[in-house]
Amino acid sequence: HSDGIFTDSYSRYRKQMAVKKYLAAVLGKRYKQRVKNK
């Protein structure tokens, strides 16, 4: 798997992907905000 995330539970894997997606969205928004403020 691409980034070393390992779990034996499929639902836990889906949860990890959901968290990763959320963090990507939050960090993406922050980055866009910083660029905008410059």
């Epitope: 691409s2 499929y10 639902s11 889906r14 997606k21």
Partner: antibody
């Protein structure tokens, strides 16, 4: 309603590779868990692996580790399953399937791959 | 891997009679999220499988209520309360709790 359309039947020589495609419509492709399952003639079902396209994150069944590669092209909403070092036992119908509520709610029509010399 | 054992391998039932298929897993399918990812598929000849029941007992929309699923932990059952001609198919249980995802060997249901 998600629809999955797979590529056509293939005949391959032992030792070669095959790449099967699965085009999704009617859903947010990048946010789907796309699985591949195969079924040898007259046999049961066997899970091969999955991809989560938004991160191109993959998980493979131990049995196929090192021999299978699942990829996705978000621009065309298409997933691919490539199986290498083919042998006669790989003759099977290969299905793509999409997870919903932790089970496979939508299935492609299947792609028959025949491995023969 | 989790081993899914289905019984019987085949089943011949008269029209209108009850058909019961059993599925046993080699370890509990109860996940840490409190859900049990035990599913049933129906496959007719020349067709892809179709989701019938998921999360042990939730029927897929459009599936007749003569189909029901029950069980917990390691022991599960699919019941067809009154077999119809269109129910002739192979039925598979499979688990989506643990990697690697695994399937039972299938039960072929026929008309007696």
């Amino acid at each position: 309603e998600v629809q999955l359309v797979q590529s056509g039947a293939e005949v391959k020589k032992p030792g070669s590779s095959v790449k099967v495609s699965c085009k999704a419509s009617g859903g947010t492709f990048s946010d789907l868990y796309m699985h591949w399952v195969r079924q040898a003639p007259g046999q049961g079902l066997e899970w091969m692996g999955l991809i989560y396209p938004i991160f191109a994150d993959t998980r493979y069944a131990q049995k196929f580790q090192g021999r299978v590669t699942i990829t996705a092209d978000e621009s065309t909403s298409t997933a691919y399953m490539e199986l290498s070092s083919l042998r006669s036992e790989d003759t099977a119908v290969y299905y793509c399937a999409i997870d919903q509520d932790g089970s496979f709610a939508y299935w492609g029509q299947g792609t028959l791959v025949t491995v023969s010399s | 891997d989790i081993v899914m054992t289905q019984s019987p391998d085949s089943l011949a039932v008269s029209l209108g009679e009850r058909a019961t298929i059993n599925c046993k897993s080699s370890q509990s399918l109860l996940d840490s999220d409190g859900k049990t990812y035990l599913n049933w598929l129906q496959q007719k000849p020349g067709q892809p499988p179709k989701r019938l029941i998921y999360l042990v007992s939730t029927r897929e929309s459009g599936v007749p209520d003569r189909f029901s699923g029950s069980g917990s932990g390691t022991d599960f059952t699919l019941t067809i309360s009154s077999l119809q001609a269109e129910d002739v198919a192979v039925y598979y249980c499979w688990q989506g709790t643990w990697f690697d995802l695994t399937f039972g060997g299938g039960t072929k249901v026929e008309i007696k």
